[in-house]
Amino acid sequence: MADGSSDAAREPRPAPAPIRRRSSNYRAYATEPHAKKKSKISASRKLQLKTLLLQIAKQELEREAEERRGEKGRALSTRCQPLELAGLGFAELQDLCRQLHARVDKVDEERYDIEAKVTKNITEIADLTQKIFDLRGKFKRPTLRRVRISADAMMQALLGARAKESLDLRAHLKQVKKEDTEKENREVGDWRKNIDALSGMEGRKKKFES
């Protein structure tokens, strides 16, 4: 934090003389890539964050898998009793095998019936969905755009409400002070509108068309 206080103590630099540019330069200025904004987070820190996020995601997946295993175990323990063989001989074990096979056959029959019902339902749902589309007319899906997601948002998505309490990542980051960007006096005119127009998808399209 010492750096911060020394910055505040320094005298502000005098602004450089305004540079006049010819209007022919404006198009090039708008279309050429701008000087990259200096990232707040260093590359190594970004990598560290990514690794941390992946670790958390991996832990979550492992926990979910463990929960599923436990759930399966609980479900099986209610459906399948432990074998009680004490005092049972060859005759009973033979009969028990027959009983268990009969039970398996019954369960298989039930499973087959359920599968048949499910297949029937799926077919019906598909038919109804098709009818809905036919009634609506052609349905056009909106094109999906790629969205940049911040580390905070990613943590929020991964951990939900726990994100805040588990790790406030930003608190651990070294604050990098923004350097004062040189402010230029630019002519007031249509060029600003041109830049706005050209910076979006329309602008790129026009650039490729020209």
Partner: antibody, heavy 121, light 107 residues
């Protein structure tokens, strides 16, 4: 000392129902399978039912299947035989017996004194 | 069902005699055979299990043998307390079945 005491027998009409009980003592009841065996008036022994140590599995001859139900309460060390739709041929002395096995050979190693059931119109 | 049959329903012997009771199964029961004794008062006791194994507390005067479908119980040196009915039982297949029993009497 291993002991089994049957109770609940009696005289009843065909089609009637009855529940026999067998109180076991002198051994860890929940570790053993148990059986009911009956002896007809002609002195023939007939196996009636067997239940596994935890009560999950039961075995019956065709003659009683669907009419008789063997059950147990390990907390009370008690074995039961629920008898429904009783017939005259079910008239017998009903014995409760402990099961054990040796290399796949199962046997009734201890028997109770029996409880008499008479089905007559 | 496996049928169990004894050669005789009753047998007369004198005290001190060696007595053999036979039992036959309608099919192979691979030594899964047990012998029981029923006293005149109705009490039933296990004598022999798995063809030849002597149950705890049973006198060594009792012995069992056999294989396949043919089995036998032998009482050496018959005593008064041995006067009872003897049953064989197969443990090979459900339903478990007993024979009709052999009543041992004194001559």
């Amino acid at each position: 000392e291993v002991q089994m005491v049957e109770s609940g027998g009696g005289l009843l009409k065909p089609g009637g129902s009855l529940k026999l009980s067998c109180a076991a003592s002198g051994f860890t009841y929940s570790n053993y399978a148990m059986s009911w065996v009956r002896q007809t008036p002609e002195k023939r022994l007939e196996w009636v039912a067997t239940i596994s140590s935890g009560g999950s599995y039961s075995f019956y001859p065709d003659s009683v299947k669907g009419r008789f139900t063997i059950s147990r309460d390990n907390a009370k060390n008690t074995l039961y035989l629920q008898m429904l739709s009783l017939r005259s041929e079910d008239t017998a002395m009903y014995y409760c017996a402990r099961r054990d096995n040796y290399f796949g050979s199962s046997f009734m190693d201890y028997w109770g004194q029996g409880s008499s059931v008479t089905v007559s119109s | 069902d496996i049928q169990m049959t004894q050669t005789s329903s009753s047998l007369s012997a004198s005290l001190g005699d060696r007595v053999t009771i036979s039992c036959r199964a309608s099919q192979e029961i691979t030594n899964y055979l047990n012998w029981y004794q029923q006293k005149p008062d109705g009490t039933i006791k296990l004598l022999i299990y798995y063809t030849s194994r002597l149950h705890s507390g049973v006198s060594s005067r009792f012995s069992g043998s056999g294989s396949g479908t043919d089995y036998s119980l032998t009482i050496s040196n018959l005593e008064q307390e041995d006067i009872a009915t003897y049953f064989c039982q197969q443990g090979h297949t459900i339903p478990l079945t007993f024979d009709t029993g052999t009543k041992l009497e004194l001559k």
